[in-house]
């Protein structure tokens, strides 16, 4: 997260770490005891899933290792429509006060609405520098028409833009997957935005999760 | 320091493959994509695909769909880059290209490897 | 798929001129282009991204502008080691990547 603030302690139970070995791979977010929903970029062939703690690396966090993620049919590694996955958990994820499912979304929140988005992704760019502890950074949605006006038809239907107008406050490499929380709801993954990040008024591009909740909940019943 | 190092020079007969290596040293792998680019003596450069560090996602110029394998090691952050089939027209140096971006998408090509001659001849 | 058509293909010009090269995308790439130097019997280096930010390391008497179809790179006084092969890319991020044909610069 460039440009963001140390989230408060325990306030997102839902955010998770996709690592590969003890390297950060990507954001997620738990949606029930056996499944994190991530971007479909996120795709690799097995996961080390650290829950319960806004510390990477942390040696007292829950870590379940996943074997089995199910990319939305119709991604694109072209033009990166449908940019969601499902990984199920190999074992079911212990509830807690700082282990909870997010609340997935009844509509679609309009532009203009407040938000947060969180990750443990590198603060600097292009020059990395990977945080320990989980950031965030409150943003506002923002319309299609005026997000078109930047990223022309790179933007897909089912894509969601976020920024602050004039902020460097962005999204970056590491974040991807994570949850963009609005109003309680998750309303968006991180999927993608310019580069070097926090160029001010290119907003972060995510998946935007309301159009999917029918492809979400089929896909853990089919495969529950 | 931070710099991809490529395997080394190769002559083919055609209707042969060849398999070229790059190794990526000094940056975190993972996080971004190898795209290969070939140049054809005396003339421009030419894209031939992508490919996701993590995931193996790729995409590859149309016409070498079928010739074409882009592949990668994480755990010796080295990617590789197979073409069949050879003919003469595929003599050329092949270079590969980190593909810098975040998420889904990537913008422009940062750092590049020194270059593989192969030559194709009978 | 997006063709980048480059002008000229080679120019000639003494040290200290001011050389201007262009680039122009067959349909609007927006702002999505980015400028690459190549030496003879070296790998392609990475100038200018995103139309007209300087790549780290690169001397300021490069610079780029544009947007949408038309582009250009310019050398403000060009240097004994500035003679080389100059190439855009409008990937506009989306695949197939295509590279406009080249600009030798050549000492007069």
């Known amino acids: 997260i460039i440009d963001g603030y140390k989230c408060k302690e325990g306030s997102h139970p839902w955010q998770v770490a996709l690592l590969k070995g003890n390297q950060l791979h990507c954001g997620g977010v738990l949606v029930d005891k056996y499944w994190v929903l991530t971007a479909a970029h996120c795709k690799m062939g097995q996961y080390q899933v650290q829950l319960g703690s806004d510390k990477i690396g942390d040696q007292s966090a829950q870590k379940i290792k996943a074997t089995k993620s199910f990319r939305h049919p119709g991604y694109s590694t072209k033009t990166h429509v449908n940019d969601i996955m499902l990984v199920r958990l190999d074992e079911p994820v212990k509830m807690s006060s700082k282990v909870e499912a997010v609340q997935l979304p009844e509509h679609c929140e309009p532009p203009g609405t407040s938000c947060t988005v969180s990750g443990w992704g590198t603060t600097t760019s292009p020059d990395v520098t990977f945080p320990s502890d989980l950031m965030c950074s409150d943003v506002k949605l923002i319309s299609s028409r005026e997000c078109k006006k930047v990223y022309k038809d790179l933007l897909g239907k089912t894509m969601l833009c976020a920024g602050i107008p004039d902020s460097k406050t962005n999204t970056c490499n590491g974040d991807s997957g994570g949850p963009l929380v609005c109003n309680d709801t998750l309303q968006g993954l991180v999927s993608w935005g310019t580069y070097p990040c926090g160029q001010p008024n290119d907003p972060g591009v995510y998946t935007q999760v309301c159009k999917y909740k029918r492809w979400v909940m089929e896909t853990m019943k089919t495969h529950r | 320091q931070v710099q991809l190092v490529q395997s080394g020079a190769e002559v083919k007969k055609p209707g042969a493959s060849v398999k070229v290596s790059c190794k990526a040293s000094?940056?975190?792998?993972?996080?971004?994509?190898i795209s290969w680019v070939r140049q054809a003596p005396g003339q421009g450069l030419e894209w031939m695909g992508w490919?996701?560090?993590?995931?193996?996602?790729?995409n590859y110029a149309q016409k070498l769909q079928g010739r074409v394998t882009m592949t990668t090691d994480t755990s010796t952050s080295t990617a590789y880059m197979e073409l069949r089939s050879l003919r003469s027209d595929d003599t050329a140096v092949y270079y590969c290209?980190?593909?810098?971006?975040?998420?889904?998408?990537?913008?422009?090509?940062?750092?590049w490897g020194q270059g593989t001659m192969v030559t194709v001849s009978s | 798929d997006i063709q980048m058509t480059q002008s000229p293909s080679s120019l000639s010009a003494s040290v200290g001129d001011r050389v201007t090269i262009t680039c122009r995308a067959s349909?609007?790439?927006?702002?999505?282009l980015n400028w690459y130097q190549q030496k003879p019997g070296k790998a392609p280096k990475l100038l200018i991204y995103?139309?007209?930010s300087l790549q780290s390391g690169v001397p300021s008497r490069f610079s780029g502008s544009g947007s949408g179809t038309d582009f250009t790179l310019t050398i403000s006084s060009l240097q004994p080691e500035d003679f080389a092969t100059y190439y855009c890319?409008?990937?506009?991020?989306?695949?197939?990547?295509?590279f406009g044909g080249g600009t030798k610069v050549e000492i007069k």
């Open positions: 000094g940056y975190t792998f993972g996080p971004y994509g």
């Open positions: 995103g139309a007209s």
């Open positions: 890319d409008g990937s506009y991020s989306t695949p197939p990547i295509t």
């Open positions: 490919i996701s560090a993590y995931s193996g996602d790729t």
């Open positions: 290209a980190r593909a810098a971006g975040y998420g889904a998408r990537w913008w422009y090509f940062d750092l």
């Open positions: 349909q609007s790439i927006s702002s999505y």
